[in-house]
């Protein structure tokens, strides 16, 4: 600033007479940066951190307050200070946060509240990482809190990280929390969900498990087809292609119920496209939807496939003809 000492001079500047802060209050908003540096005691600031948030300090005044705390706690802030950081949290770097030991869910909530409505910043990601590692696992209360603030949080974790989610935590997951999950993540989450919801009755179970089905194997889809679940097309389109391919026409018809008519609109998209190509034309014709497969209508041979990612492209490129 042109009208104040340079940073190197700030610490050497004495507090003007009568300006020494006795408490953290609104009068401090009129202090220049160098006056805050000279007149506010760091220990006083630390004990009255809860007041900082209630006072509309400017961006640059908050820089000074952070600097004072950094000097007071070079090894990292204690949780009593962290809990009351408020908007000062936005000034913390991931390096600052790595020095913290945050154990209280209330502290985590308070800091996430500050960042509410914004994308997950590197600071928040670091904070969550520190918190979860400190707890040893992603328990239900933590997951509840994190997905409330960041619906996409689960899908930002690697399959390895997701493996530490206990099945009991799955109860906190809402369908929208899984919107951006890829198949590898759902492969990890699905068995946990299956375990978590295993004691529910058929229709309730399907409502809960539905958003996890992108990780379900063929045998579970076959089992669901026997339960009149009426899966919608949006859910069907998210199923693993390798899990859908072995299903018979009858099983898919039972699985989808009245939604089976939607297959026609999706016939060019995976996994419907690839599943159609694997069916006998006679069987497809029973649906009365005009779906065109490429298999003959005679003997039904089940060929073994490696369900790798190249399979769909082979089907599409070569339009494999099936022979006896």
């Amino acid at each position: 600033d042109a009208a104040q000492p340079a940073a190197s001079e700030v610490e050497k500047t004495a507090c003007p007479s009568g300006k020494k802060a006795r408490e953290i209050d609104e009068s401090l908003i009129f202090y220049k940066k160098w006056e805050l540096e000279a007149c506010v005691d760091a220990a006083l600031l630390a004990t009255q951190m809860d007041r900082v948030n209630a006072i509309p300090f400017t961006y640059e005044q908050l820089d000074v307050l952070k600097h004072k705390l950094d000097e007071l706690y070079p090894q990292g802030y204690p949780e009593s200070v962290i809990q009351h950081l408020g908007y000062l949290f936005l000034k913390m770097s991931p390096e600052d946060i790595r020095k913290w030991n945050v154990t209280s869910l209330e502290t985590l909530k308070a800091l996430l509240e500050v960042n509410k409505g914004h994308e997950m910043s590197p600071q928040v990601a670091t904070l969550i990482d520190r918190f979860v590692k400190g707890r040893g696992q992603l328990d239900k209360d933590t997951l509840d809190t994190l997905t409330a603030f960041y619906p996409g949080y689960l899908c930002s974790l690697s399959p390895e990280e997701l493996s530490s989610v206990p099945p009991s935590s799955i109860w906190a997951v809402r369908p929208q929390d899984l919107d951006t999950c890829d198949p590898r993540q759902l492969d990890v989450l699905y068995p946990k969900a299956r375990l978590a919801f295993q004691n529910m009755n058929g229709s309730e179970y399907f409502v809960k498990i539905q958003s996890f089905l992108g990780g379900a194997p063929t045998e579970d889809l076959k089992a669901l087809s026997q339960q009149n679940v009426s899966m919608d097309l949006a859910t069907f389109m998210k199923l693993r292609t390798d899990a859908v391919l072995p299903l018979t026409v009858a099983e898919v018809q039972k699985l989808l119920g009245p939604h089976v008519e939607g297959l026609k609109a999706e016939e060019r998209h995976r996994p419907v496209r690839d599943w159609i190509l694997r069916q006998r034309q006679d069987d497809l014709d029973t649906l009365g939807l005009g779906l065109q497969g490429t298999r003959g209508s005679h003997h039904h041979h089940h060929h073994e496939f490696r369900h790798d990612s190249g399979l769909n492209d082979i089907f599409e490129a070569q339009k494999i003809e099936w022979h006896e």
């Epitope: 042109a2 009208a3 609104e26 961006y59 640059e60 005044q61 908050l62 500050v114």
Partner: antibody, heavy 122, light 107 residues
Framework: QVQLQQSGAEVKKPGASVKVSCKAS????????MHWVRQAPGQGLEWMGI????????TYAQKFQGRLTMTRDTSTSTVYMELSSLRSEDTAVYYC???????????????WGQGTLVTVSS | DIQLTQSPSTLSASVGDRVTITCRAS??????LAWYQQKPGKAPKLLIY???SLASGVPSRFSGSGSGAEFTLTISSLQPDDFATYYC?????????FGGGTKVDIK
């Protein structure tokens, strides 16, 4: 949508006091600081002070210290600005304007009341 | 207190003109500067914040630039609705202060 609805015009005698209200709606009242800004006829804008609706903390520009009082009623999401010892130069349109509670990088006024004309005349 | 000086104080222009208004601060205000538009009998309306960020719902013909002590508001092609008075405001430090205003009228 966000609305700041101010009370009607006032005519006051020199030495009297005036109390202007500003009722907020369409957002979480306690998440935004409320400021008062005035504008004398044909003149520019002048910042008067601020109230934090959450805790009731107030800060006034030095020029108005001792004459200005800001209060709030969270039950009705209303803030009040009272200016005492009025003189003719206090004739102005008084605006309430909100600023989001943030890390200091957002202290611009994103919503304003419609303004209240206060005329001080003997 | 930080003084903000706007120039020119009055500007006559025609529809379609490119208009530039300057705001100078008496000391460094970093990027903590906003611009407002005010029409007669109305409250000011936020146009630009943080020196160059366009407020929600504001047409893209408005733009802001600058940092430190010198800032500009530019209207790339003046429209009939743009004839008004424009104010800058700093929020680097308290008290918050405004420039004296620039009135844009029809040539």
């Amino acid at each position: 949508q966000v609305q700041l609805q101010q009370s009607g015009a006032e005519v006051k005698k020199p030495g009297a006091s005036v109390k202007v209200s500003c009722k907020a709606s369409g957002y979480t009242f306690t998440n935004y600081y409320m400021h008062w800004v005035r504008q004398a006829p044909g003149q520019g804008l002048e910042w008067m002070g601020i109230i934090n609706p959450s805790g009731g903390y107030t800060t006034y520009a030095q020029k108005f210290q001792g004459r200005l009082t800001m209060t709030r009623d969270t039950s009705t999401s209303t803030v009040y600005m009272e200016l005492s010892s009025l003189r003719s130069e206090d004739t102005a349109v008084y605006y309430c304007a909100r600023i989001r509670s943030c890390g200091g990088d957002c202290y611009y006024f994103d919503n304003w009341g419609q303004g209240t004309l206060v005329t001080v005349s003997s | 207190d930080i003084q903000l000086t706007q120039s020119p104080s009055t500007l006559s222009a025609s529809v379609g003109d490119r208009v530039t208004i300057t705001c100078r601060a008496s000391e460094n205000v970093n990027i903590w500067l906003a611009w407002y538009q005010q029409k007669p009998g109305k409250a000011p309306k936020l146009l630009i914040y943080k020196s160059s960020s366009l407020a929600s719902g504001v047409p893209s013909r408005f733009s802001g630039s600058g940092s430190g002590a010198e800032f500009t508001l530019t209207i790339s092609s003046l429209q009939p609705d743009d004839f008004a008075t424009y104010y800058c405001q700093q929020y680097q430090s308290y008290p918050l202060t405004f420039g004296g205003g620039t009135k844009v009228d029809i040539k």
